[in-house]
């Protein structure tokens, strides 16, 4: 990896837990502030593989609440506007990070935390095992 | 929003910064253990809009690696197996949350920010504007 | 209103054929997923095969090659060719209808009962 | 092979809420259905899609589905709800349906 030199007005770390326990700072910096929110808002409708999108909230995460794809068909959506099995829709996932309340229901305490999520859908060929 | 009693056994929030600043465990708790990493590892293949993984790499950001997803064509592979211009590969994108080292090269200092990250490609029905 | 009724059970030998029928009545067979699920003795569901609106055919590891489903758009019904069987086919068989998104199903038959035994 | 997991049996007393959890490697990105199966009958569909219940359904039935896990929720049970129940969901990977082995309700 890259060696960084530390920098000398870094907050104090004798905590015995370091370098488990850091602090953060809540206050978002968003990186997108020039990115269309509406860009990508229409996707799961023109997609061939359209998906729905479903609300999954969770006080005890941040961010609390998480909007998860499952895709609309089994397959994807021809030229003719027909869903064609030969083809299936599946989810895009991606593992994310979120910050879980620990001990539970504390309002300055996490824990990071791994989760799995469905971003939207993409129409593959299937794969089909033939039998001998 | 749901209100939740607050645990007694939650660290001290004396800190004049608090509620904005907090203490994260980095010791993640993966949600997934079950799950398989190769379950979506070839849809960027054999999906009819094909994407290329980029490597992003910050080491002020935590995780300090990140995949980023590009269209392999404009249009989408059709049954041919050629690339179909009526149709367009775009990109779906998800903001997510990472940690990024305030101040800069600290290492147990961290402020949340959000980015925008391209998953994988979905194929698309273009959006035709006609001229009146 | 939505009727399926399977036929064409009965008692075969290990090695032996059967056809199943599901006639159907109150919608388009040709329009709707139809699938055959089974179910063992005293066992849970089991998926066998789907024939979905557009055509193709999909079929559970432990029949493909030797099952094969059909339907019939003109008599508006749904069948299960079954070659070689098993003592492990031993089943009452159901046809199901799948809807639109393909993902349940949302109309069962009485089912039929198959019995592979010498 | 893609593989639901049920318990084997829940019991409630007639008036309390059942609640019956199906388990899979990541389910909430599927879509979840529940079947009711009484003794000597057909299936018949009591959830569709996670958490759409079927006209004629009661509506002491209710679902949902996130994480790895489905969940079909009987509130004020009754003695008729007693029955198998079996859960059902489309795998991607292999584009096979997959039941769950089922689980015995039982209403004391």
């Known amino acids: 990896g890259i060696t960084i030199p530390r920098n000398p007005g870094c907050p104090n770390s004798e905590d015995k837990n370091f370098p488990r326990t850091v602090m953060v700072n809540l206050n978002i910096h968003n990186r997108n502030t020039n990115t269309n929110p509406k860009r990508s808002s229409d996707y799961y409708n023109r997609s061939t593989s359209p998906w729905n999108l479903h609300r999954n909230e969770d006080p005890e995460r941040y961010p609390s609440v998480i909007w998860e794809a499952k895709c609309r068909h089994l397959g994807c959506i021809n030229a003719d506007g027909n869903v064609d099995y030969h083809m299936n829709s599946v989810p895009i996932q991606q593992e994310i990070l979120v910050l879980r309340r620990e001990p539970p229901h504390c309002p300055n305490s996490f824990r990071l935390e791994k989760i799995l999520v469905s971003v939207g859908c993409t129409c593959v060929t299937p794969i089909v095992h033939h039998v001998a | 929003g749901i209100t939740i009693p607050r645990n007694p056994g939650c660290p001290n929030s004396e800190d004049k910064n608090f509620p904005r600043t907090v203490m994260v465990n980095l010791n993640i708790h993966n949600r997934n253990t079950n799950t398989n990493p190769k379950r979506s590892s070839d849809y960027y293949n054999r999906s009819t809009s094909p994407w290329n993984l980029h490597r992003n790499e910050d080491p002020e950001r935590y995780p300090s690696v990140i995949w980023e997803a590009k269209c392999r064509h404009l249009g989408c592979i059709n049954a041919d197996g050629n690339v179909d211009y009526h149709m367009n590969s775009v990109p779906i994108q998800q903001e997510i949350l990472v940690l990024r080292r305030e101040p800069p090269h600290c290492p147990n200092s961290f402020r949340l920010e959000k980015i925008l990250v391209s998953v994988g490609c979905t194929c698309v029905t273009p959006i035709v504007h006609h001229v009146a | 209103q939505v009727t399926l009724k399977e036929s064409g059970g009965g008692l075969i030998q290990p090695g032996g054929s059967l056809r199943l029928s599901c006639a159907t009545s109150?919608?388009?067979?040709?329009?709707?997923?139809m699938s055959w699920v089974r179910q063992a003795p005293g066992k849970g569901l089991e998926w066998v095969s789907i024939?979905?609106?557009?055509?193709?055919?999909y079929y559970a590891d432990s029949v493909k090659g030797r099952f094969t489903i059909s339907r019939d758009n003109s008599k508006n019904t749904l069948s299960l060719q079954m070659n070689s069987l098993r003592a492990e086919d031993t089943a009452v068989y159901y046809c199901?209808?799948?809807?639109?998104?393909?993902?349940?199903?949302?109309?069962w038959g009485q089912g039929t009962l198959v019995t592979v035994s010498s | 092979s893609y593989e639901l997991t049920q318990p084997p049996s829940v019991s409630v007393s007639p008036g309390q809420t059942a609640t019956i959890t199906c388990s899979g490697d990541?389910?909430?990105?599927?879509?979840a259905s529940w079947y009711q199966q009484r003794p000597g009958q057909s299936p018949v569909l009591v959830m569709r899609?996670?958490?759409q219940r079927p006209s004629g359904i009661p509506e002491r039935f209710s679902g949902s589905n996130s994480g790895n896990t489905a969940t079909l929720t009987i509130s004020g049970t009754q003695v008729m709800d007693e029955a198998d129940y079996y859960c059902?969901?489309?795998?991607?990977?292999?584009?096979?349906?997959?039941f769950g082995p089922g689980t015995k309700l039982t209403v004391l």
């Open positions: 990541d389910l909430g990105s599927k879509y």
């Open positions: 199901a209808r799948g809807r639109y998104s393909g993902w349940y199903f949302d109309y």
């Open positions: 109150g919608f388009t067979v040709s329009s709707n997923h």
């Open positions: 899609q996670d958490d």
């Open positions: 059902q969901t489309w795998d991607h990977g292999t584009s096979k349906y997959v």
């Open positions: 024939i979905y609106s557009d055509g193709t055919t």
